[in-house]
């Protein structure tokens, strides 16, 4: 028997992945767990192994499908399970009627790349990765530029309150070298969440003219 | 095998109310979603609305404006399907069917007659 | 609501034909796209889901392809007992919604 409060939290990148963690205080050694999800309305179900990622948490990533392909509805309800083997049998450790479109947390933005830089701007262009048609254009984002002799966390955030894949950084300093990060996230789901970062994209400010003001 | 069987024709005059069954074998009947859906004649199909009959949950066709009721007896696996305030239009066949990616199983259907 | 416009909505053909119908969504509803066959006074029954899957039991001679808006059902050789009205749906929202049918006849 296993004792202590447990966790169950997943969440859906709107297309083919669900991905979950689970913890448990009372923390189970050396036994076998899985995710089991079981969609009201379609034929597929899947599994995946919970994996350790700290002393009481585990994770995994229930893959429903080619990365592209729209496996679930704004409809659809998803019963997970967390099954630990118990001897020859599987325990339920944990279970949730999911709602995989009001639990969205999508992939990072990718392929950011510098468009256009100068002395004191630079606008910058990435893509959305693995979205659903469901989003048209109900998505947000999140932006941060990291200068010189600060850290992430200090960095401000901009927003952009619309499907918006470009930014252009103003005020930025001549022959400098900065670090520029991307988030997205549905405006739908009411436990929907913020993507991870993207990569960071660095790039350097052009110099500014010989004899000229700055 | 999964068989839908459903209730027999009704007649019904304008403002009454029609309560339609399908009767569920061969699966388990609390784990899928049964719909109904209408055949008028002359119209296209139309998608009514459906229940999951191991939690009570519902959706509906806003088009029926709170005249379709859909409801289940799960210890006799049938669902139920009332449709009140009648009017000549809603002169149709009903079918109720499982849904699991697509309706795979339909019911014989359900001729309901209203008419003064 | 999505608007589901099947075409054509009749037509006749040879046994042994290929025969092409085609479905077209009013926005873009994935892969959720189904198909079915009634025959004059029987209930309907599925063939296709999800686009291109062969419900149990339907013989393989039945196909369906496409994606996002526009979508394709297929009989590659048609067989006497085909005669019936096809119809296209989508689960890709509430309200589902069908096609208006389309009336295979043989020559």
């Known amino acids: 028997a296993v004792n202590g409060t447990s966790q169950f939290t997943c969440f859906y990148n709107s297309r083919a992945n669900i991905s979950c963690v689970w913890s448990q205080d009372g923390a189970l050694q050396d036994t076998s767990c899985q995710v089991h999800a079981w969609p009201d309305r379609r034929r597929w179900n899947q599994t995946c192994e919970l994996l350790p990622v700290s002393q009481a948490s585990w994770a995994c990533n229930l893959i429903l499908g080619a990365p592209d392909s729209q496996k679930l509805t704004t409809v659809d309800i998803v019963t997970l399970r967390v099954l630990c083997r118990e001897g020859v049998r599987w325990r339920v450790m944990a279970i949730q009627d999911f709602k995989p479109f009001e639990n969205l947390r999508l992939m990072a933005p990718i392929s950011l790349q510098v468009v256009h830089v100068e002395t004191h701007r630079c606008n910058i262009s990435w893509e959305i990765s693995q979205a659903s048609h469901y989003f048209e254009r109900h998505l947000e984002f999140e932006a941060r530029t990291l200068s010189p002799g600060h850290t992430w966390e200090e960095a401000p955030l901009l927003t952009l309150k619309q499907k918006q894949e470009w930014i252009c950084l103003e005020t930025l300093t001549p022959d400098t070298q900065y670090e520029f990060q991307v988030r997205v996230k549905p405006l739908q789901g009411e436990f929907t969440t913020w993507s991870p970062w993207s990569q960071p994209l660095a790039f350097r400010t052009k110099p500014a003219a010989l004899g000229k003001d700055t | 095998q999964v068989q839908l069987v459903q209730s027999g024709a009704e007649v019904k005059k304008p403002g009454a109310s029609v309560k339609v069954s399908c009767k569920a074998s061969?699966?388990?009947?609390?784990?899928?979603?049964i719909t109904w859906v209408r055949q008028a004649p002359g119209q296209r199909l139309e998608w009514m609305g459906d229940?999951?009959?191991?939690?009570?949950?519902?959706n509906y066709n806003e088009k029926f404006q709170g005249r379709v009721t859909i409801t289940v007896d799960t210890s006799a696996s049938t669902a139920y399907m009332e449709l009140s305030s009648l009017r000549s239009e809603d002169t149709a066949v009903y079918y109720c069917?499982?849904?699991?990616?697509?309706?795979?199983?339909w019911g014989q259907g359900t001729l309901v007659t209203v008419s003064s | 609501d999505i608007q589901m416009t099947q075409s054509p909505s009749s037509l006749s053909a040879s046994v042994g034909d290929r025969v092409t119908i085609t479905c077209q969504a009013s926005q873009d509803i994935s892969n959720f796209l189904n198909w079915y066959q009634q025959k004059p006074g029987k209930t309907l029954k599925l063939l296709i889901y999800y686009t291109s899957g062969l419900h149990t039991g339907v013989p393989s001679r039945f196909s369906g392809s496409g994606s996002g808006t526009d979508f394709t059902f297929t009989i590659s050789s048609l067989q006497p007992e085909d005669i019936a009205t096809y119809y296209c749906?989508?689960?890709?929202?509430?309200?589902?919604?069908f096609g208006q049918g389309t009336k295979l006849e043989i020559k």
């Open positions: 229940i999951y009959p191991g939690s009570g949950n519902t």
């Open positions: 749906q989508q689960d890709n929202n509430h309200p589902y919604t």
């Open positions: 069917a499982r849904e699991r990616g697509g309706f795979d199983y």
């Open positions: 061969g699966y388990t009947f609390t784990s899928h979603w």
